[in-house]
Amino acid sequence: SEVEYRAEVGQNAYLPCFYTPAAPGNLVPVCWGKGACPVFECGNVVLRTDERDVNYWTSRYWLNGDFRKGDVSLTIENVTLADSGIYCCRIQIPGIMNDEKFNLKLVIKPAKVTPAPTRQRDFTAAFPRMLTTRGHGPAETQTLGSLPDINLTQISTLANELRDSRLANDLRDSGATIRIG
């Protein structure tokens, strides 16, 4: 059965999908669709790549990773409850019945309602500007940028994003990839 992924309303959702190109730049067409993968295609396509580039996308759907290296994980921006459901990642490997298809279940949870603190605190000094997550090779760094006032809700959101990023890297490290060639 499909693997389940979760995100909160208003956050970005991450659906992992990877393959290993036979050679650098030797890309395979990939499509992402809303709905379970049909027999040949991708369902209601939200994003598509060809041998060179992303050649079709719709608003809020994008590839955040390096798709030229086979990271075709889908990011859905600012999700709503309507984004819940099954998504299809199809790696259209040339040849006879070589396609790899993956059904991923996205569950959207309502946003946590965090009571506002009685006095706004300045977490700038206490909260680091850089968050480092485990990845391949050099440390992957997420930069928060200039955030003069980070409230509790923002910290919760950042922590969730960090957790999701770690999950993504764990998936990548676990070898959940398709090798081609």
Partner: antibody
């Protein structure tokens, strides 16, 4: 208006080869999975081959290794190369467009081209 | 491969009457809550025409007298009131697995 026009059929001897073509118009050809479906005289329908929008190929065991489906998106044309033909390959061959986003069923069909394999 | 068995092979019906055609699959064609079964109509000398997709969805331009039902392995095409132009051969087809397969057909003839 969506149109699919097959050509290339004819009489061929057992063991021979033939290439069928299907000229497509009226839609964005590259976005659709395409199939060939055949019908032997007085018989039912048999799916013969499919090619996805991404170029993946699919065949039933009855033609695997003998038939090759291909497409030229620049020319909006679908092909079926048929080798090592047998008497049982005699049929009307239809080019069919797979429904967008799915591909596994067919919303437009050509008029068909007759292939006769006989000595 | 999924084998589709249609019955009856021939159905004799008078114009204006109701026709019920059956298609049985050798295994379930359910997929994430959708039945991946289609129905086509074919008249002599013509290409097939899509009538019903996903078991019960009527294709655009198809008269409302055509309807489809069923799930799992048992499917039905119903023509509520046969018109003269409906006398033809009808095929079911599954799109769950390769190879795609068709039923053997039901010929609807004038009684």
């Amino acid at each position: 208006e969506v149109q699919l026009v097959e050509s290339g059929g004819g009489l061929v001897q057992p063991g021979g080869s033939l290439r069928l073509s299907c000229a497509a118009s009226g839609f964005t050809f590259s976005r659709y999975a395409m199939s060939w479906v055949r019908q032997a005289p007085g018989k039912g329908l048999e799916w013969v081959a499919a090619i996805s929008s991404g170029g993946s190929l699919y065949y039933p065991d009855s033609v695997k290794g003998r038939f090759t489906i291909s497409r030229d998106n620049a020319k909006n044309t679908l092909y079926l190369q048929m080798n090592s033909l047998r008497a049982e390959d005699t049929a009307v061959y239809y080019c069919a467009r797979g429904r967008e986003a799915d591909g596994g069923y067919f919303d437009y069909w050509g008029q068909g081209t007759l292939v006769t394999v006989s000595s | 491969e999924i084998v589709l068995t249609q019955s009856p092979a021939t159905l004799s019906v008078s114009p204006g009457e109701r026709a019920t055609l059956s298609c049985r699959a050798s295994e379930s064609v359910e997929y994430y809550g959708t039945s991946l079964m289609q129905w086509y109509q074919q008249k002599p000398g013509q290409a097939p025409r899509l009538l019903i997709y996903a078991a019960s969805n009527v294709e655009s331009g198809i008269p409302a007298r055509f309807s489809g039902s069923g799930s799992g392995t048992e499917f039905t095409l119903t023509i509520s009131s046969l018109q003269s132009e409906d006398f033809a051969v009808y095929y079911c087809q599954q799109s769950l697995k390769v190879p795609l397969t068709f039923g053997g057909g039901t010929k609807v003839e004038i009684k």
